[in-house]
């Protein structure tokens, strides 16, 4: 008499996350009389997937009618796959006794879940970053099967190079994930730039997954003063102005010294924006002169957010100012300098 | 060789259904997406939507939501475009068109055309 | 949706001659551009993809540039069997757009 053959005519079944998945087995012979069982994988640690006799599989079902007279089709259909549900599946014949004998097996069929990425999740630095520094930008997506993907970072229209990117784990896996990292070299102008991390794998097929990142998050543009007298006026006053331009983000506080002490703090808000997204911001003082019997000292101290505070200061000369003052001067553009005006 | 083999002319009358057939050969049909694109006469391209071909999924172009439906009978690797109701501004060649791999998204394969006249 | 813009709807030109075609998008698709040229009664057929990226086949006289939101398809020097309508068409965004189309005719 011809052997008994367990026919899996199927080496790999590949199966998107979701659908349904049928492992197909057959029979060569009805003798030796026993029955069907489904596992996955082998040895001693297999896993029961379905036994006709005996047992509870609500996901699976079989292909035929199992009761059938002279059945010799013992597919089975499993339903809803996730990427849990990988591995080799084997249809294995018994010999019916007391225990039943495993008697032979087929060839096993592998089972592999197509599953989609998650969507990128892109995060910046914790702390912000000045023109000229490097940043670096993280992007993750998880649960995706096959382990063969393709990511790519963008920022204003070009492609960045500057990226690191892992894919876990490196061995067999039901599912796998992504972790990217971008470097990206910041500029004066990218208050209004995002970096984009795109990721695309086969069961995306028409449309990739994109995750943004703002680097108005990342960057600090500090800010640059400078210090002007306007003409003296009829009354002896002097208005002096303090512009604050281009910085980001809007948390600022000014603060006025005369001759050292604080004469005027201001809190920057509701500011309009520039083109680039920076802000700019002017403070007035107006200082009588006639008050004062000698120099008097002024500072425009400047606390961009939370950063060391910047000051310019100049002097106005009191002893030998005339009554109409027709000069524009401005401060010297360097951190403490002072400026004398006549 | 890559082959998007599409059906013959239709003649409609307005009302009625129509049914279009791209079937592919050369490549793993459930690996790439099928594209469909409308060319009025004299006009340019439109482009009506996606299929996904391993999960089934639809996108469709705003103006081609409602009446318009992308089939697929992967064991025959072939994809369907079905307009139902046509009217006579349906009138126009459709294209299939197959999705491009990895981050190259553009349709690299293109159907020769099925010319679909609505008419009374 | 994004919008592609072809300047010109049609060009008269001379064999010989050297053709450029300009695309512009309405935001920036990051180098996701492809040119197609179409002859009357034919499907499209893909020239370049990626901006700059010939396919395989295409006649190295033709070239595709640009970057952000501006493109350019050029035509060395022009055979008769160029003459064609052709198309740029963004595929960084759904919906995919088409440009109205260049048609390229002989003087």
């Known amino acids: 008499e011809e052997e008994l053959q367990v026919i899996q005519p199927e080496k790999s079944v590949s199966v998107a996350a979701g659908d349904s998945a049928t492992l197909n087995c057959t029979v060569s012979s009805l003798i030796p009389v026993g029955p069907i069982q489904w596992f996955r994988g082998a040895g001693p640690g297999r896993e029961l997937i379905y036994n006709l006799k005996e047992g509870h599989f609500p996901r699976v079902t079989p292909v035929s009618d199992p009761t059938k007279r002279n059945n010799m089709d013992f597919s089975i259909r499993i339903s809803n796959i996730t990427p849990a549900d990988a591995g080799t599946y084997y249809c294995v014949k018994f010999r019916k006794g007391s225990p039943d004998v495993e008697l032979k097996s087929g060839a096993g069929t592998e089972l592999s879940v197509r599953a989609k990425p998650s969507a990128p999740v892109v995060s910046g630095p914790a702390v912000r970053a000045t023109a000229e520094h490097t940043v670096s930008f993280t992007c993750e997506s998880h649960g995706f099967s096959p382990r063969d993907i393709t990511l790519k970072w963008f920022k204003n229209g070009n492609e960045l190079s500057d990226v690191q990117t892992n894919v876990d784990p490196a061995g067999k896996s039901v599912s796998y994930s992504i972790r990217s990292t971008a470097r990206v070299v910041l500029t004066r102008r990218d208050v209004h730039s995002q970096v984009i991390c795109e990721v695309a794998h086969v069961t995306l097929q028409g449309d990739p997954l994109r995750g943004t990142a703002n680097l108005s998050e990342a960057i600090r543009v500090p800010p640059f003063l400078e210090v002007t007298q306007q003409s003296m006026r009829a009354d002896n006053q002097v208005n002096v102005t303090c512009q604050v331009t281009k910085f980001y983000p809007q948390r600022l506080q000014l603060t006025w010294l005369e001759n050292g002490n604080v004469s005027r703090t201001e809190m920057a808000s509701a500011l309009p924006e520039n083109k680039d997204g920076t802000y700019n911001w002017t403070s007035w003082l107006l200082v009588n002169v006639s008050a004062h019997r000698d120099d008097v000292k002024l500072t425009c101290q400047v606390e961009h957010d939370g950063q060391p505070a910047v000051n310019k200061s100049f002097s106005v000369k009191v002893s030998a100012h005339p009554k109409e003052q027709g000069s524009n001067t401005a401060a010297e553009n360097t951190g403490t300098n002072e400026r004398n005006i006549y | 060789q890559i082959q998007l083999v599409q059906s013959g002319p239709e003649l409609k009358k307005p009302g009625e259904t129509v049914k279009i057939s791209c079937k592919a050969s050369g490549y793993t049909f459930t690996d790439y997406a099928m594209h469909w694109v409308k060319q009025a006469p004299g006009k340019g391209l439109k482009w009506m939507g996606w299929k996904n071909t391993e999960t089934g999924e639809s996108t469709y172009a705003e103006d081609f939501k409602g009446r318009f439906a992308f089939f697929l009978e992967t064991s025959a690797s072939t994809a369907y475009l079905q307009i139902n109701n046509v009217k006579n501004e349906d009138t126009a060649t459709y294209f299939c068109?197959?999705?491009?791999?990895?981050?190259?998204?553009?349709?690299?394969?293109w159907g020769q055309g099925t010319s679909v006249i609505v008419s009374s | 949706d994004i919008q592609m813009t072809q300047s010109s709807s049609s060009f008269s030109v001379s064999l010989g001659d050297r053709v450029t075609i300009t695309c512009k998008a309405s935001?920036?698709?990051?180098?996701?551009l492809a040119w197609y040229q179409q002859k009357p009664g034919n499907a499209p057929r893909l020239l370049i993809s990626g901006a700059t990226s010939l396919e395989t086949g295409v006649p190295s006289r033709f070239s595709g540039s640009g970057s952000g939101k501006d493109y350019t398809l050029s035509i060395t020097s022009l055979q008769t069997e160029d003459v064609a309508t052709y198309y740029c068409q963004q595929y960084w965004n759904s919906p995919r757009t088409f440009g109205g189309g260049t048609k390229l005719e002989i003087k």
């Open positions: 935001e920036d698709i990051y180098n996701r």
């Open positions: 068109a197959r999705g491009g791999y990895g981050s190259n998204y553009v349709m690299d394969y």
